[in-house]
Interface confidence: low
């Protein structure tokens, strides 16, 4: 679990505790829903999503979904509750600090999905686990 921020004033509807009783608060995720993407045949991509949002519910994590078919490539960025399936798949890696893509079986397309639990972690989607960017400029994605 990502260590929680200490909050001075808490709305009751925001209070959620992890297994150790620590209070968790909503995290920041890229949230552009589905957009066309140029990410293809790369070890890692930036989302190019210009919207950073704080998830509605404290238990939600960041999710990215990369899809390729005969016509286009899309990248979906959202918040989602890991207790619930997304695109019919369980978010197995929701506790990961990085968004490491895993291929899922979907007829008629190539489908990768990742989830993660650190702020804006679905901004940098990783297709190769050993990949580690050394260029900080790549991480500077303007947000709103």
């Amino acid at each position: 679990t990502i260590p929680p921020h200490v909050q001075k004033s808490v709305n009751n509807d925001m209070i959620v505790t992890d297994n150790n009783g620590a209070v968790k608060f909503p995290q920041l995720c890229k949230f552009c829903d589905v957009r066309f993407s140029t990410c293809d045949n790369q070890k890692s991509c930036m989302s190019n999503c210009s919207i950073t949002s704080i998830c509605e519910k404290p238990q939600e994590v960041c999710v990215a979904v990369w899809r390729k078919n005969d016509e286009n490539i899309t990248l979906e960025t959202v918040c989602h509750d890991p207790k619930l399936p997304y695109h019919d798949f369980i978010l197995e890696d929701a506790a990961s600090p990085k968004c490491i893509m895993k291929e899922k079986k979907k007829p008629g397309e190539t489908f990768f999905m990742c989830s993660c639990s650190s702020d804006e972690c679905n901004d940098n989607i990783i297709f190769s686990e050993e990949y580690n960017t050394s260029n900080p400029d790549l991480l500077l994605v303007i947000f709103q």
């Epitope: 919207i51 950073t52 947000f143 709103q144």
Partner: antibody, heavy 122, light 107 residues
Framework: EVQLVESGGGLVQPGGSLRLSCAAS????????MTWVRQAPGKGLEWVSV????????AYADSVKGRFTISRDNSKNTLYLQMNSLRAEDTAVYYC???????????????WGQGTLVTVSS | DIQMTQSPSSLSASVGDRVTITCRAS??????LNWYQQKPGKAPKLLIY???SLQSGVPSRFSGSGSGTDFTLTISSLQPEDFATYYC?????????FGQGTKVEIK
Amino acid sequence: EVQLVESGGGLVQPGGSLRLSCAASGFTFDINAMTWVRQAPGKGLEWVSVISGSGGTTAYADSVKGRFTISRDNSKNTLYLQMNSLRAEDTAVYYCARRGQYRYIAGATDYWGQGTLVTVSS
Amino acid sequence: DIQMTQSPSSLSASVGDRVTITCRASQSISSYLNWYQQKPGKAPKLLIYAASSLQSGVPSRFSGSGSGTDFTLTISSLQPEDFATYYCQQSYSTPPTFGQGTKVEIK
């Protein structure tokens, strides 16, 4: 109660520098992105800059890029705007504002300071 | 940058009137549209976010609608404290841009 109090404004000559501060209280500072917005006398609102809660991500309006630097000290609950190479057209009231915390409010500034006036003139 | 155009730039109205202000974006911004009220010498105040969501503490006579490129702020029954300048702002992409403002004056 959320409070944002700006300071550091004043009269400065063209080409000069100024550092604005914004002291925040009443909320958890480090989970909110913060922005600076300015308003020239008798004119409308102009967004200047934004910084993420951790300070790791920043963005600037083209009109100030390369001259202004936004930063924050989360241990002091303080937001800063370092303004260099100031021009007459930078004359404005500068507001610090908090970005909202929930999904669709994330792009809206839900609390604003009272503003501090920066006058660039010889 | 996305351009935001408000109309009218000013209007005169009486207490009790229904007032409508429109805002048009130069491209689709989905529902990422916010409305602010500003009184002379004061900081702006958030009224509406996400096109139609009323900010906490804002009277229910204020409402917002629209999506895509066309948006509306409505004050159902103008009160004396509502005479101010109103700004729309898109938060779809950086830089977030404001409309030029609509000044609501007493008739």
